[in-house]
């Protein structure tokens, strides 16, 4: 198939006291590869400190995946989810506290 | 000291392209992305696009997806702007930039692209 | 596309003069906000981030406010070599755009 570039959709949740845990969501695309990282003052975190999802099928012939990390409170604003796909990329911030979701089709 | 230094300022005609390099210097360069933004004279600053340079993964804008190429040479840590189709309102300076997170911390001196007959 | 207004075009102001320059984003960009000054023929250069961030080496007579879609640059007392031409940035989403920039001139 024809390649389908990825909705990605950040979010925040609370985690313990002083911290947030961000997520990076990346849905609807194809084919399958892709890079999902979160990225500190632009440089990626390392493997270690981040939790990665599966890439999974969602029914439609297109793939989804997701990446979380940890972080503190107040923070927020130095990362960035980066995501890679069929040699385009593109940069995701975290939302503001009071705005949880971040959608954006990546052409 | 994290540097970026273009190249020189090129005069091409109508319908040519001309390609920008911007060297890099002081940091890790495949850690960063590099960004390219214009600025017409006496005008404000427009956007072109990005490159990952340990990658080649590219994000541009819309605006000039057909027309730039963003490229990077890892062995001498220099990234390329390259417009083709060339028209006099591409007359511009051409400025690289890091991208550290979520802003622009760096930025090359500007090359100054004049498209004329 | 964010589009970023910024105002006014141009201000004459004196030397120990409060400036202040508006940004209004047609968006929320959760304060991922630049602010830059450029003088002639001189690439532009960081003056603050994340809205309210002073960049290393600014002086403490800048500074920047906001959130959401309205932000603020404030030169507490403007001195001879603040005169220049200012520029936001939002870093939301891509394309990142400016504002059309802001010039200082000696009144």
């Known amino acids: 198939g024809s390649t389908v570039p990825p909705m990605v959709n950040v979010t925040r949740s609370e985690a313990s006291e002083g911290n947030i845990t961000v997520t990076c969501r990346a849905s609807s695309f194809y084919p399958r590869n892709i890079i999902l990282t979160w990225r500190q003052d632009g440089v990626s975190l390392s493997h270690d400190t981040q939790q990665w999802g599966d890439v999974l099928p969602d029914g439609n012939g297109t793939y989804q995946t997701w990446v979380a990390t940890r972080i503190c409170r107040g923070e927020e604003q130095r990362f960035t989810c980066y995501m890679e796909h069929s040699g385009n990329h593109s940069t995701h911030p975290v939302p503001s506290g009071n705005s949880h979701h971040h959608h954006h089709h990546h052409h | 000291e994290v540097q970026l230094v273009q190249s020189g300022a090129e005069v091409k005609k109508p319908g040519a392209s001309v390609k920008v390099s911007c060297k890099a210097s002081g940091y890790a360069f495949t850690n960063y992305l590099i960004e390219w933004v214009r600025q017409a004279p006496g005008q404000g600053l427009e956007w072109i696009g990005a490159i990952n340079p340990g990658s080649g993964a590219t994000n541009y804008n819309e605006k000039f997806k057909d027309r730039a190429t963003l490229t990077a040479d890892k062995s001498t840590n220099t990234a390329y702007l390259e417009l083709s189709s060339l028209r006099s309102e591409d007359t511009a300076v051409y400025f690289c930039?890091?991208?550290?997170?979520?802003?622009?911390?760096?930025w090359g001196q500007g090359t100054l692209v004049t498209v004329s007959s | 596309d964010i589009q970023m207004t910024q105002s006014p075009s141009s201000l004459s102001a004196s030397v120990g003069d409060r400036v202040t320059i508006t940004c209004r984003a047609s968006g929320n960009i959760h304060s991922y906000l630049a602010w830059y000054q450029q003088k002639p023929g001189k690439s532009p250069k960081l003056l603050v981030y994340y809205a309210e961030t002073l960049a290393d080496g600014v002086p403490s007579r800048f500074s920047g406010s906001g959130s959401g879609t309205d932000y603020t640059l404030t030169i507490s007392s403007l001195q001879p070599e603040d005169f220049a031409t200012y520029f936001c940035q939002q870093f939301w989403t891509t394309p990142y755009t400016f504002g059309q920039g802001t010039k200082v001139e000696i009144k």
């Open positions: 930039a890091r991208f550290l997170g979520n802003y622009f911390d760096n």
